[in-house]
């Protein structure tokens, strides 16, 4: 049995898969910040995790996915306010009893040192210095991401 948050995450992922593929994003849109091969957008309001997830999708983006410790540190370096927490795209899957990214992959236990419990209705937030497990209903800010995907020239065989 999936929780409402897991259902919401799956629905958004499926609808994203159904949409026609867009050309690659070469530069970050206005208001977005570039971090390596990603564009990040920091919210200026607060929401529970599932509303944050949905709001990123309205920007044709997703909640932030963090590949490794190095990317976490670089992202945290962009956070200017000490005490502010931001949702990222990671929540606890009750059915699999594990932290699960919204793209369906599981957290590599070495990637993030999470403060707090791994339990039902827990979602992950980051601050300038730490990574926290919070109740998904907590209302905090969030970070959306778009991948920068340089367009490669297609080579067509002679007709």
């Amino acid at each position: 049995q999936k929780s409402s948050i897991e259902k919401c995450s799956v629905d958004i992922q499926q609808s994203r898969n159904k949409t026609t593929e867009r050309p690659g994003l070469l530069n970050c849109p206005i208001y977005w910040q570039q971090l390596r091969e990603k564009c990040l957008l920091f919210s200026h309001t607060v929401n529970p995790w599932n509303n944050s997830l949905a709001d990123c999708s309205t920007k044709e983006s997703s909640l932030l996915l963090i590949r490794d410790k190095d990317e976490l540190i670089h992202t945290q370096n962009l956070i200017r306010d000490k005490a502010i927490l931001f949702w990222i795209g990671l929540n606890f899957s009750l059915s699999e009893k594990n932290w699960k990214w919204i793209n369906g992959s599981f957290l590599n236990s070495n990637d993030l040192e999470i403060r707090g419990d791994a339990k039902e209705n827990s979602c992950i937030s980051i601050s300038q210095t730490s990574v926290y497990s919070e109740y998904c209903s907590t209302e905090i800010r969030w970070i959306c991401q778009k991948e920068l995907t340089p367009v490669r020239n297609k080579v067509y065989p002679d007709s």
Partner: antibody, heavy 120, light 107 residues
């Protein structure tokens, strides 16, 4: 047409509390975050805090955390700010102001302001 | 807290003149700066967002520029209705802060 209609001027005694209202019309009330701003001496502007009308989530400027309480009534599309334990320092014009975008901190529509005078 | 300083509290100009209103941030705020106009007895009205993007319906005589710590609002040809206070605001941090305002007076 977007409008934010605030309650009228108030004269209150030191130590009292009071609540200012801000009735929104012309847009989806739950779709935009509401902010409150204090203007002292006709000039100095200070951001007090925000409330997400859809969820009731709030975030305050630490300076006003014990001074202001933000709430909303979705059924009447009205935001409220209660000011507590008033002193002469709280005499000012208070504005509600709509956040223009979830991802940028600017205010695209403002109420007409509510003048608060704290005096014995 | 980031302090936004508008060094000119008053500026006097004539109709048709070009005027530059400046604002200095105490630390780098990128382009997360807004300019507001407050005419006498009215509430503030947004003119410019993201340092240089004119808000919908704002006359093109208003132009914003700058990044980092130094920002300018330019009125290319002042009109009598531009008599107002002008405020800058930063949102680079979540504690939004405003400049002290510049009152534009028409000679």
């Amino acid at each position: 047409e977007v409008q934010l209609q605030q309650s009228g001027p108030e004269l209150v005694k030191p130590g009292a509390s009071m609540k200012i209202s801000c009735k929104a019309s012309g847009y989806s009330f739950t779709g935009y975050t509401m902010n409150w701003v204090k203007q002292s001496h006709g000039k100095n502007l200070e951001w007090i805090g925000l409330i997400n009308p859809n969820t009731g989530g709030t975030y305050y400027n630490q300076k006003f955390k014990d001074k202001a309480t933000l709430t909303v009534d979705k059924s009447s599309s009205t935001a409220y700010m209660e000011l507590l334990s008033l002193t002469s320092e709280d005499s000012a014009v208070y504005y509600c102001a709509r956040l223009g975008d979830n991802y940028r901190g600017y205010f695209d529509f403002w109420g007409q302001g509510t003048t608060l005078t704290v005096s014995s | 807290d980031i302090v936004m300083t508008q060094s000119h509290k008053f500026m006097s100009t004539s109709v048709g003149d070009r005027v530059n209103i400046t604002c200095k941030a105490s630390q780098d705020v990128g382009t997360a700066v807004v300019w507001y106009q407050q005419t006498p007895g009215q509430s503030p009205k947004v003119l410019i967002d993201w340092a240089s993007i004119r808000h919908t319906g704002v006359p093109d005589r208003f132009t914003g520029s700058g990044s980092g710590t130094d920002f300018t609002l330019t009125i290319s040809s002042v009109q009598s209705e531009d008599l107002a206070d002008y405020f800058c605001q930063q949102y680079s941090t979540y504690l939004y802060t405003f400049g002290g305002g510049t009152k534009l007076e028409i000679k």
